[in-house]
């Protein structure tokens, strides 16, 4: 999906009002020194591409993020504010239902959500020019 035509300001508002709080709740008890952000993004469409990938694509050691509150709110925001996004997700959602697993917060998941927090920070404030 190409995120270029999303309403970025509306997504940013959804992030600040709810998604960010759910991310913080998920990470509560984790040391702020624990994870270095290794995934980065250069502009808002790129940030949303990376956010979608990390939130909804199961990875080795962390298969359960899509059912977390922040993920459901992310999905809702993208569905509302990115034209045509919902249609692209129907097949992916059906495939995910088939391999649904119980929620387990692993260290790998915590690391992944730490990366997500970093991506959302950069989505929120994509203002830097390279020197």
């Amino acid at each position: 999906y190409d995120f270029t035509n999303c309403d970025f300001e509306k997504i940013k508002a959804a992030y600040l009002s709810t998604i960010s709080k759910d991310l913080i709740t998920y990470m509560s008890g984790t040391k702020s020194t624990e994870f270095n952000n290794t995934v980065s993004c250069s502009n808002r469409p790129h940030c949303l591409t990376e956010i979608q990938s990390l939130t909804f694509n199961p990875t080795a050691g962390c298969a359960s993020l899509a059912k977390e509150m922040f993920a459901m709110k992310t999905k809702a925001a993208l569905a509302i504010w990115c034209p045509g996004y919902s249609e692209t997700q129907i097949n992916a959602t059906q495939a995910m239902k088939k391999r649904r697993k119980r929620k387990v917060t692993t260290n790998k998941c915590l690391e992944q959500v730490s990366q997500l927090q970093g991506l959302w920070r950069r989505f929120n404030r994509p203002l830097l020019k390279q020197q």
């Epitope: 960010s20 913080i24 702020s32 952000n37 959302w120 920070r121 404030r125 830097l128 390279q130 020197q131």
Partner: antibody
Framework: QVQLQQSGAELVRPGTSVKVSCKAS????????IDWVKQRPGQGLEWIGV????????NFNEKFKGKATLTADKSSSTAYMQLSSLTSEDSAVYFC????????????WGQGTLVTVSA | DIQMTQTSSSLSASLGDRVTISCRAS??????LNWYQQKPDGTVKLLIY???TLHSGVPSRFSGSGSGTDYSLTISNLEQEDIATYFC?????????FGGGTKLEIK
């Protein structure tokens, strides 16, 4: 806990330059932007600019372009601001501040560095 | 640049009072309004971001509200440790700009 430790007060001559440091601890240095803010005696706060310690990317308030240079040293988790061609207008307390967890607002501040420009 | 105006440069109140500090932006800032506390020794703390979200560790007696161009910070039950100068800051448009500050004093 998150801490930003700034270098000590500086008394400098007009026309020279000064470099203020801001050593970060208690968090992953490259994960968060660091902003710099100016406060003249008895006055309000002015945003100077921001650096991404991970990439070295910067952005400035137009008013401080050519005046301030922002850099960061990942190995020592230290951000720097150099001020050049100093005049009495540059006499102020300078703060470094780290952005919040969500990237909105300046969540953690250094104690400030007083720069006095005087002949 | 967006101008941020804090109409009261100083306010006097008694301990236990409810205190409201106001801040006005020269244009709509879409709730991207943050509040800071600067103690007499110069230390600065973030209190509230995005109009009404309390930063971690900030007492619940602090609250923020507003929209468009008009915003306010309320301290519901003034304590001695709240004696400080309070600044608003807009994060909507570069360059970020601050209000002139409101110094809170005890009657």
């Amino acid at each position: 806990q998150v801490q930003l430790q700034q270098s000590g007060a500086e008394l400098v001559r007009p026309g020279t330059s000064v470099k203020v440091s801001c050593k970060a601890s208690g968090y992953a240095f490259t994960n968060y932007f660091i902003d710099w803010v100016k406060q003249r005696p008895g006055q309000g706060l002015e945003w100077i600019g921001v650096i991404n310690p991970g990439s070295g990317g910067t952005n400035f308030n137009e008013k401080f372009k050519g005046k301030a240079t922002l850099t960061a040293d990942k190995s020592s988790s230290t951000a720097y601001m150099q001020l050049s061609s100093l005049t009495s207008e540059d006499s102020a307390v300078y703060f470094c501040a780290r952005e919040s967890e969500v990237g909105e607002g300046f969540a953690y501040w250094g104690q400030g560095t007083l720069v006095t420009v005087s002949a | 640049d967006i101008q941020m105006t804090q109409t009261s440069s100083s306010l006097s109140a008694s301990l236990g009072d409810r205190v409201t500090i106001s801040c006005r932006a020269s244009q709509d800032i879409s709730n991207y309004l943050n509040w800071y506390q600067q103690k007499p020794d110069g230390t600065v703390k973030l209190l509230i971001y995005y109009t009404s979200t309390l930063h971690s560790g900030v007492p619940s007696r602090f609250s923020g509200s507003g929209s468009g161009t008009d915003y306010s910070l309320t301290i519901s039950n003034l304590e001695q440790e709240d004696i400080a100068t309070y600044f608003c800051q807009q994060g909507n448009t570069l360059p970020y700009t601050f209000g002139g500050g409101t110094k809170l004093e005890i009657k």
